[in-house]
């Protein structure tokens, strides 16, 4: 099943997020992703856990998954690099870099997103944008077009309360509020964008969605700048 959904969001403006990628398995949307360099897409490591025998590709320049669009192009993956410390049973280090078979053709609908390199927490309350093609309601309806939602960043102390994530949120993770509006599983690997800069990647751990006591968890890209740089180099 696809790993991702946006709950309580709305359809995104077409091609207004030219960094947005759909990581696909055997031609079907699996996870979100974000173009961080001409030939590299950042996503979540857990996305490829069940993809051993399948064909992984990356769709760029898309708004609709099914309709023809001039900017849409499907790229093969030359190399998949999960973070060496990612493990199936934890949400830690849940990052994946996908090297496209060739440099993406850039244009108004396909453009890398600057990512945060300064390793400081985003201020609580900051409104950040998360987008994806995941399921849009609890009944499991999958959207054809890209959805998005604005979410306020939640401070780590609150997120780590026993009633919330009970200490699981390390310095390398961040949280966003999840009161009816939320990202979830199937949007894993997608971008959390604050002030036009990539700050987080949706983690792909299983979690109840849209419940304010179970905030959304995102991997802080700034904490992994050294690893990202070392792979992209």
């Amino acid at each position: 099943p696809p790993r991702g959904r946006i709950l309580g969001g709305r359809e995104a403006e077409a091609h207004a997020r030219p960094y947005m990628a759909s990581v696909q398995l055997n031609g079907a949307h699996l996870c979100g992703g974000v173009l961080v360099a001409e030939q590299w897409v950042l996503s979540a490591a857990h996305c490829l856990e069940d993809a051993a025998d399948g064909k992984v590709q990356v769709l760029l320049g898309a708004h609709s998954l099914s309709q023809p669009e001039p900017s849409k192009r499907l790229y093969d993956v030359l190399r998949a690099v999960p973070h060496p410390d990612s493990q199936p049973d934890t949400i830690d280090h849940d990052l994946l870099l996908l090297q496209l078979s060739e440099k993406a053709t850039l244009g108004p609908a396909v453009r890398p997103l600057p990512w945060q390199r300064v390793d400081r927490d985003v201020a609580p309350g900051t409104l950040c944008d998360v987008a994806g093609w995941g399921i849009v309601n609890h009944a499991g309806r999958r959207p054809d077009s890209l959805q998005h939602v604005l979410l306020p960043v939640l401070d780590r102390a609150t997120c780590n309360r026993r009633t919330h994530h009970d200490g699981a949120i390390t310095e390398r993770l961040m949280c966003a509020e999840s009161n009816r509006r939320d990202s979830c599983k199937g949007d894993s690997g997608g971008p959390l964008v604050c002030g036009g800069v990539l700050e987080g990647v949706v983690t792909s751990g299983s979690r109840v969605c849209g419940n304010r006591k179970k905030p959304g968890i995102y991997t802080r890209v700034a904490s992994y700048a050294a690893w990202i740089d070392s792979v992209l180099a």
Epitope: V81, H83, P84, D85, D92, H93, R117, D119, T170, E171, R172, S223, Y224, A225, A226, W227, D229, S230, V231, A233
Partner: antibody, heavy 122, light 107 residues
Framework: QVQLQQSGAELARPGASVKMSCKAS????????IHWVKQRPGQGLEWIGY????????HYNQKFRDKAALTADKSSSTAYMQLSSLTSEDSAVYNC???????????????WGAGTTVTVSS | DIVMTQAHRFMSTSVGDRVIISCKAS??????VAWYQQTPGQSPKILIY???TRHTGVPDRFTGSRSGTDFTLTISNVQSEDLADYFC?????????FGGGTKLEIK
């Protein structure tokens, strides 16, 4: 054989600048990332920063941002580091280094230059 | 910045012995730790990367391991040529940082 050959020792006055070089051989220079590391006698190692030769991107340790400037001349396969406003604290051995390994992730260093000794004295 | 602490500045051992050199990270660094050997007058030489992967040509008497934020370099069957400084390095996040070093002395 992959090698990094560094320029000779430098003696400089306080307040002056020095520019040292690191010449690579045995591999495709323009596709690698050259890091610089400082070592003072009897002390540990300090990472200064790097220059990615593929895209000319530099990343500095904040501590050295106003001290070091990293450049390269790809035509001669040579990387340079200029240290400015020298003080006695800058007296040290400076090594260039890079990761050759086929692992292709993580900034560890399996090729090192022999080092350039900088002495700052009035 | 992540601080890498090598508690023992000096360690003394005998040829044939087994010695454990430790390094503690001030916060989680995953397995992104390397170990280097530096003999007098030489540049550092890599021994181990990703906590436990031995670099090409490094004798198998050198092994690396981890428990949480504690990292160890074990040298079994110490040889006289192992007399050197040993440094750990984390490369999980910027700035990359090194331990202060442990000088291994042969009795």
């Amino acid at each position: 054989q992959v090698q990094l050959q560094q320029s000779g020792a430098e003696l400089a006055r306080p307040g002056a600048s020095v520019k040292m070089s690191c010449k690579a051989s045995g591999y495709t220079f323009a596709t690698y990332t050259i890091h610089w590391v400082k070592q003072r006698p009897g002390q540990g190692l300090e990472w200064i920063g790097y220059l990615n030769l593929r895209n000319d991107y530099t990343h500095y340790n904040q501590k050295f941002r106003d001290k070091a400037a990293l450049t390269a001349d790809k035509s001669s396969s040579t990387a340079y580091m200029q240290l400015s406003s020298l003080t006695s604290e800058d007296s040290a051995v400076y090594n260039c280094a890079f990761r050759l390994g086929n692992d292709r992730q993580g900034w560890y260093f399996d090729v090192w230059g022999a080092g350039t000794t900088v002495t700052v004295s009035s | 910045d992540i601080v890498m602490t090598q508690a023992h500045r000096f360690m003394s051992t005998s040829v044939g012995d087994r010695v454990i050199i430790s390094c503690k990270a001030s916060q989680d660094v995953g397995t992104a730790v390397a170990w280097y050997q530096q003999t007098p007058g030489q540049s550092p030489k890599i021994l181990i990367y990703w906590t436990s992967t031995r670099h090409t040509g490094v004798p198998d008497r050198f092994t690396g391991s981890r428990s949480g934020t504690d990292f160890t370099l074990t040298i079994s069957n110490v040889q006289s040529e192992d007399l050197a400084d040993y440094f750990c390095q984390q490369y999980t996040t910027y700035p990359l940082t090194f331990g202060g070093g442990t000088k291994l002395e042969i009795k």
